[in-house]
């Protein structure tokens, strides 16, 4: 038996009862997997909100855009998308919200055209260091990935391995230097407390970096110097207190960067003076007139651009004999 062929003008759906029959035989070039909708004209397959527990084996060879969102995949094994013949055209793969908690080494191997990958909204307790590089070689074959979307992939506290979540993600990004061509990286909403200092230096092609809605307190040890192509840096909704001179100078030196800093708890004391001076001068920060102080209490809601040096003082540190308990 064969599933209905996809029409050039609309999506076709396969009947669920055909699933077992189809998966046992080699895929026909134009067939559509059970529980999926296919459009050959749009080169698109959508298997959305179907509670799938594994990636369909009988994906059509023409697929360029594959949506596997809202499923229950749990684990993405090595070669999860390896097929004979390979899915040579697959360029965009969206796996968001599919309850993935483990992505194994080589999960995306044999996808030579894969440019966009979205793993957002999956509780990734176990992301293999070789999930994107495919091998444990010190230098892997370059990945074709240009966009990697990893928003809200942090698992609940009780499901985390006994290791740094930031470190696990960064290890996967840096393994084998496979992602040298990556242009967009989204890591929003991941409870990141810090950014490992080596991560950005090894992603030299980045154009867009989204670190919004994390818990970053400082950028002191992060270097942006090599990111000469960076166009947008999203740091909204973090825990940043101040940006220091080294960071300011590096950002100022990037020729077409736009930095977004809204909704951080800026501490408007004497350490903020350099940042305020820079903000008044720079074109780098978008919406800079919206930035306000959070601390100290007497400065709350004051607009950073309206502050002058007299406003930015630090309370003197009392000698121990004068401090109260």
């Amino acid at each position: 038996s064969s599933s209905p062929t996809s029409s050039a003008s609309s999506f076709s759906s396969s009947a669920p009862f055909l699933a077992s029959a189809v998966s046992a035989q080699p895929p026909l070039p134009d067939q559509c997997p059970a529980l999926c909708e296919c459009s050959e004209a749009a080169r698109t397959v959508k298997c959305v909100n179907r509670n799938l527990t594994e990636v369909p084996t009988d994906l059509p060879a023409y697929v360029r855009n594959l949506f596997l969102t809202g499923n229950q995949l749990a684990v993405l094994p090595a070669g999860a998308f390896a097929r004979r013949p390979p899915l040579a055209e697959l360029a965009a793969l969206n796996l968001s919200g599919s309850r993935l908690d483990e992505v194994r080494a080589g999960a995306f191997e044999h996808l030579p055209s894969l440019r966009q990958l979205d793993l957002s909204h999956n509780p990734l307790a176990d992301l293999s260091p070789f999930a994107f590089s495919g091998s444990n070689a010190s230098v892997s074959a370059p990945s074709p990935l240009v966009e990697l979307i990893l928003n809200h992939i942090v698992p609940p506290e009780d499901e985390r391995q006994n290791r740094s979540f930031e470190g696990m993600v960064v290890a996967a990004l840096l393994a084998g230097r496979a992602l040298q061509g990556l242009r967009r990286l989204e890591l929003a909403s991941n409870h990141f407390l810090y950014l490992p200092r080596d991560v950005l230096a090894q992603l030299p092609s980045l154009r867009h970096l989204d670190l919004s809605n994390n818990s970053l307190v400082s950028l002191t040890y992060v270097s942006f110097r090599n990111l000469t192509h960076l166009e947008s840096l999203h740091l909204e909704d973090n825990a940043l207190k101040v940006l220091h001179n080294g960071t300011l100078a590096e950002l100022q030196g990037l020729p077409h960067i736009r930095v977004f800093l809204d909704n951080n708890p800026w501490v408007c004391d004497c350490h903020m003076a350099d940042m305020v001076t820079w903000l008044k001068e720079t074109e780098v920060v978008q919406g800079k007139d919206r930035l306000t102080c959070a601390y100290p209490e007497k400065m709350r809601n004051r607009v950073l651009l309206e502050l002058n040096s007299a406003d930015l003082d630090c309370d003197p540190i009392l000698p121990p004999s004068l401090q109260t308990s």
Epitope: E231, I257, K280, E281, T282, E283, V284, L305
Partner: antibody, heavy 117, light 108 residues
Framework: EVQLLESGGGLVQPGGSLRLSCAAS????????MSWVRQAPGKGLEWVSY????????SYADSVKGRFTISRDNSKNTLYLQMNSLRAEDTAVYYC??????????WGQGTLVTVSS | DIQMTQSPSSLSASVGDRVTITCRAS??????LNWYQQKPGKAPKLLIY???SLQSGVPSRFSGSGSGTDFTLTISSLQPEDFATYYC??????????FGQGTKLEIK
């Protein structure tokens, strides 16, 4: 009402110097970056120079780099363009404009600079 | 340097016509593009900023679209006061602006 008024244009010989001024009113001058843009007779617009709100950052078009200097006096609400080593191809109407995040949202009426012997 | 190329260089149209002017950048500039109108002997006036945002006070018959390298300015129904020269301008690089060569819109 935002107003920008250029002055200082005129006839100057090749190799000579001229200083243009732009008096600003109707907005908080020290809060805005500013730019100079020029337009040769019968030609299109050419961006010339940029200065940040407190003068810490400046930039220039390649065609004027090393010859023109942009500056500002926030206490006088005035923008300047010092033009040295003038050439015939610098002949143009020079406009000052308020620069807001890459957008030139207000312009003066311009002052004509003629470089000729 | 980023080059901006406008087309056509000149255009004849009648009152009430729908007119489209295009601007092409020599590399991707995201949405960092503005449009200006200039009438003879006058300073340029900002119409559209950030590719598609209408400047306050500008009639709604003006609209802008595009991103990357290709942009358009559209006047939905030409009015007598719209006959002028139109310029696009990019601001992808901080502090380094470039204009298109202009499109002269004339009465047919």
């Amino acid at each position: 009402e935002v107003q920008l008024l250029e002055s200082g244009g005129g006839l100057v010989q090749p190799g000579g110097s001229l200083r243009l001024s732009c008096a600003a009113s109707g907005f908080t001058f020290s809060s805005y970056a500013m730019s100079w843009v020029r337009q040769a007779p019968g030609k299109g617009l050419e961006w010339v120079s940029y200065i940040s709100s407190y003068g810490g950052y400046t930039s220039y078009a390649d065609s004027v780099k090393g010859r023109f200097t942009i500056s500002r006096d926030n206490s006088k609400n005035t923008l300047y363009l010092q033009m040295n080593s003038l050439r015939a191809e610098d002949t143009a109407v020079y406009y000052c404009a308020r620069y807001h995040s890459g957008v030139l949202d207000y312009w003066g009426q311009g002052t004509l600079v003629t470089v000729s012997s | 340097d980023i080059q901006m190329t406008q087309s056509p260089s000149s255009l004849s149209a009648s009152v009430g016509d729908r007119v489209t002017i295009t601007c092409r950048a020599s590399q991707s500039i995201s949405s960092y593009l503005n449009w200006y109108q200039q009438k003879p002997g006058k300073a340029p006036k900002l119409l559209i900023y950030a590719a598609s945002s209408l400047q306050s006070g500008v009639p709604s018959r003006f609209s802008g679209s595009g991103s990357g390298t290709d942009f358009t300015l559209t006047i939905s129904s030409l009015q007598p006061e719209d006959f002028a020269t139109y310029y696009c301008q990019q601001y992808y690089y901080h502090y380094l602006l470039t204009f298109g060569q202009g499109t002269k819109l004339e009465i047919k």
